[in-house]
């Protein structure tokens, strides 16, 4: 029988200078593309290799944003949130949340509907 | 991933048409934004167009536009080129290109891009 997997949720302010290609990253999400269920967030689904997200280190595929520049990402449309990072100026600064997965007992199994997966 | 297999390309006089298309295999591929690139001989590859993951967010470069049309069908994992007036200058080796999610960058770069196909020839005479 497998263990419980947990999850250990951890919050952090990542701030970001757009470099000469821009932040360096990849979203999935919003109200109209959940990615998670029951979920209309935005979630990183990519890091471009040698981006300031890259550089930077600390964003990683499958942290969920939780805002940019102090302006809440929650409820709005996959584009909606696309064109706000693009708009978001040179300095940009990340509300970001971190889902490590703490294994508890036997290997567990990631579920279809993670989005670290 | 996805792998990405194109098809479609061909020898066609100018002011022909030609449909490409490039299938994915893998999961998720109404999550990936999809792209052609081309690249003509002894130049560098370059962007034509682009679609986000909702037949949405779509973009041109300058020298197709009002002459190329790009389109997804999610439930056959296939984007489309539908190339119209077509003209000597359009003869290269087009490439379908896909990235998992949308780049907040631009999506007019080739190095938005993650996957690549192995290409199709296009000849205009």
């Known amino acids: 029988m497998n263990g419980r997997v947990d999850y250990l949720v951890t919050e952090e302010e990542i701030n970001l200078t757009r470099g000469p290609s821009g932040l360096g990253f990849n979203i999935v999400g919003g109200t109209d593309q959940q990615y998670v269920s029951n979920d209309s967030g935005i979630y990183v689904s990519r890091i471009k290799e040698n981006g300031a997200a890259a550089l930077d280190g600390r964003l990683q595929e499958g942290d969920k944003i939780l805002s940019v520049n102090g302006q809440d990402l929650k409820n709005l449309l996959h584009q909606d949130a696309v064109d706000l990072f693009r708009n978001a100026g040179y300095a940009v600064s990340l509300r970001v949340q971190h889902r490590l997965q703490v294994q508890n007992g036997p290997i567990g199994h990631r579920g279809e509907g993670d989005p670290s997966g | 991933d996805v792998q990405l297999v194109e098809s479609g390309g061909g020898l066609v006089q100018a002011g022909g048409s030609l449909r490409l298309s490039c299938a994915a295999s893998g999961r998720s591929f109404d999550r990936y934004t999809m792209a052609w690139f081309r690249q003509g001989p002894g130049k560098e590859r370059e962007f034509v167009a682009t679609?986000?993951?909702?037949?949405?967010?779509?973009y041109y470069a300058d020298s197709v536009k009002g002459r190329f049309t790009i389109s997804r069908d999610n439930a056959k994992n296939t984007v489309y080129l539908q190339m119209n007036s077509l003209k000597p200058e359009d003869t290269a080796v087009y490439y379908c290109?896909?990235?998992?999610?949308?780049?907040?960058?631009?999506?007019?770069?080739?190095?938005?891009?993650?996957?690549w196909g192995q290409g199709t020839q296009v000849t205009v005479s």
């Open positions: 679609v986000g993951w909702n037949d949405n967010s779509i």
């Open positions: 290109a896909a990235t998992f999610g949308s780049p907040v960058d631009t999506p007019l770069d080739r190095g938005a891009y993650d996957f």
